[in-house]
């Protein structure tokens, strides 16, 4: 019997210092570029080698960025989100949602990490 895939969602505040080449990551998403169905949120699509984000080590590809320096990223056009990061200053605070895939046991069995029950 196949196991069920669940997701463990956690949030984290990540403080980055802009490096010589910037923050060092790429994003997808926005109201005009939905990366995830029915979700116009902003997601990390690439971490640049040796960039500020890579050297910090906490930001991961696939993370959803909820806010930048306290400013919500909901309902933004893609380019507006890009510009927000570019104009965020030297010290940048990111509120991030990590989504960790958890493989549970067979259906009908409450596997480890199953929040139900």
């Amino acid at each position: 019997m196949n196991g069920r895939v669940d997701y463990l969602v956690t949030e984290e505040e990540i403080n980055l210092t802009r490096g010589p080449s910037g923050l060092g990551f790429n994003i997808v998403g926005g109201t005009d570029q939905q990366y995830v169905s029915n979700d116009s949120g902003i997601y990390v699509s690439r971490i640049k080698e040796n960039g500020a984000a890579a050297l910090d080590g906490r930001l991961q590809e696939g993370d959803k960025i909820l806010s930048v320096n306290g400013q919500d990223l909901k309902n933004l056009l893609h380019q507006d989100a890009v510009d927000l990061f570019r104009n965020a200053g030297y010290a940048v605070s990111l509120r991030v949602q990590h989504r960790l895939q958890v493989q549970n046991g067979p259906i009908g069995h409450r596997g480890e990490g199953d929040p139900s029950g």
Partner: nanobody, 127 residues
Framework: EVQLVESGGGLVQAGGSLRLSCAAS????????MAWFRQAPGKEREFVAA????????YYADSVKGRFTISRDNAKNTVYLQMNSPKPEDTAVYVC?????????????????????WGQGTQVTVS
């Protein structure tokens, strides 16, 4: 994994025209930033043109500005390079490059390090 396949190369006369295509795999093609580079024998890889995810912004090397046009069709997962009035010095292998998403830093379209995925290339010879 993104795969890029170029086509449309061949022999063209100087002053003629040629259209190169680059077909990309992946359901999120509309988030890719795309570019064309070229490499002539014994020379460094050279930036030709780039286009953003929506097609609203394009960038060109000075050597091709006004002659070449980059465009994309997100419904077909394809980016194009229209080569008008090619010159013998445009002879090279033309390679397509892609990256998923937009950099939050200063965009340097001519920098190969901006891109993660590369095609095998298509030969263009201008006689």
């Amino acid at each position: 994994e993104v795969q890029l396949v170029e086509s449309g190369g061949g022999l063209v006369q100087a002053g003629g025209s040629l259209r190169l295509s680059c077909a990309a795999s992946g359901r999120t093609f509309s988030t890719y930033e795309m570019a064309w580079f070229r490499q002539a024998p014994g020379k460094e890889r050279e930036f030709v043109a780039a286009i953003n995810w929506s097609g609203s912004s394009t960038y060109y090397a000075d050597s091709v500005k006004g002659r070449f046009t980059i465009s994309r069709d997100n419904a077909k997962n394809t980016v194009y390079l229209q080569m008008n009035s090619p010159k013998p010095e445009d002879t090279a292998v033309y390679v397509c490059a892609a990256v998923i998403g937009s950099t939050v830093d200063e965009y340097r379209p001519s920098d190969p390090l901006e891109y993660d995925y590369w095609g095998q290339g298509t030969q263009v010879t201008v006689s």
